[in-house]
């Protein structure tokens, strides 16, 4: 099993859409694909896919999964808040038939304030 | 490119324990998402899967063999091995090692394979 | 295990005409999961080892020409030659990845009439 996710890095602005895809491969056919995509770590969503179709739609604030035969997961935030910024990892195990697990690389969003104000105040508040 | 070259002994004795490497060159084989197969031809050209180690080195065999059959690797040296145990005339083959990927998933590199006769 | 029963043995067909393999699965290699036929087919030359032509049963390699055509899902495969050349003469496998084991059919030896 394998999982290549992209993009690296991901720069939006608030009120726009963002949409992180992981690639789930396997070499032989699986049953039931258990799917998970966390950000910082805490756990967004974590539906199973069976018979081509996603047990679970919706993945955390404003967050909607889809699946597209053969292999690509996408996770669509739409709007985009200043709140969704993070790093965003895609995991995936085959359950069924035997388990096997794999992981994606990060996904850094980076969410840009529509008040330029805003922008200037973040920017400070980063130390040195 | 990716290279594969199998070595080893062509001759076995029954009862006794045939061992062969492959070389794989131009490639790691702890890549994340390949598989590296041994497949064996018998004269009759039939081909059967004996097994496969993959990138993390977790191993698959064939049922058929389970019982005889060790894959092994040595990351360092960038070769994965065969063990076939108790081996019988019935063992006389052409052995090839051969890797896939799990985004295509075929065997798209062989090596020349090796032929090997059980006999005593 | 799935059994692969390829069809037939052997073929003789005329420089220039169509060549057709079968191969038949003891279960259905086609996953709605993912859309695909988890089957491929090789071609070998003697003295060398198999070389592919296509997977997900009808997906042709690059480099492969394009009168090889693969057609089929489920159960039931086809491989295609649509024009034979001298150099098509070669032993032609079909083998699934549905699942542990692997396993090949027993070859098609393809000849010239």
């Known amino acids: 099993l394998s999982v290549q996710q992209g993009p690296n890095l991901l720069q939006v602005r608030q009120g726009s859409q963002a949409t992180l895809v992981c690639q789930v491969d396997q070499a032989t056919a699986w049953e039931r694909l258990r799917v998970k995509w966390t950000k910082d770590g805490a756990i967004l969503c974590q539906p199973y896919i069976t018979n081509g179709s996603l047990s679970l739609g919706v993945c955390g604030p404003q967050g909607r999964l889809s699946w597209q035969a053969p292999s690509h997961l996408t996770l669509q935030l739409d709007p985009v808040s200043l709140n969704h910024s993070g790093a965003y990892v895609c995991w995936a195990a085959v359950e069924i038939p035997e388990l096997e697990e794999a992981e994606g690389n990060i996904t850094r969003l980076f969410v840009d304030p529509d008040d330029p104000t805003q922008n200037r105040n973040r920017i400070a508040s980063f130390p040195g | 490119q990716v290279q594969l070259q199998e070595s080893g002994p062509g001759l076995v004795k029954p009862a006794q324990t045939l061992s062969l490497t492959c070389t794989v060159s131009?490639?790691?084989?702890?890549?994340?998402?390949?598989?590296w197969s041994w497949i064996r031809q018998y004269p009759g050209k039939r081909l059967e899967w004996i097994g496969y180690?993959?990138?993390?080195?977790?191993?698959s065999y064939n049922p058929s063999l389970k019982s005889r059959v060790t894959i092994s690797r040595d990351t360092s040296k960038n070769q994965f091995s065969l063990k076939l145990t108790s081996v019988t005339a019935a063992d006389t083959a052409t052995y090839c090692c051969?890797?896939?990927?799990?985004?295509?998933?075929?065997?798209?590199?062989w090596g020349q394979g090796t032929m090997v006769t059980v006999s005593s | 295990d799935i059994v692969m029963t390829q069809s037939p043995d052997s073929l003789a067909v005329s420089l220039g005409e169509r060549a057709t393999i079968n191969c038949k699965s003891s279960?259905?290699?086609?996953?709605?999961?993912?859309?695909?036929?988890?089957l491929n087919w090789y071609q070998q030359k003697p003295g060398q080892s198999p070389k592919l032509l296509i997977y997900?049963?009808?997906t042709r390699l690059s480099g492969v020409p394009d009168r090889f055509s693969g057609s089929g899902s489920g159960t039931d495969f086809t491989l295609t030659i649509s024009s034979l050349q001298a150099e098509d003469v070669a032993d032609y496998y079909c083998?699934?990845?549905?699942?542990?084991?692997?396993?090949f059919g027993d070859g098609t030896k393809l000849e010239i009439k």
């Open positions: 051969a890797t896939m990927a799990d985004r295509f998933a075929f065997f798209d590199v």
């Open positions: 131009g490639f790691s084989i702890s890549t994340s998402g390949y598989y």
């Open positions: 180690i993959n990138y993390g080195g977790g191993t």
């Open positions: 279960q259905s290699l086609f996953s709605s999961n993912t859309n695909r036929n988890y």
């Open positions: 997900h049963a009808s």
């Open positions: 083998q699934h990845h549905y699942e542990t084991p692997l396993t």
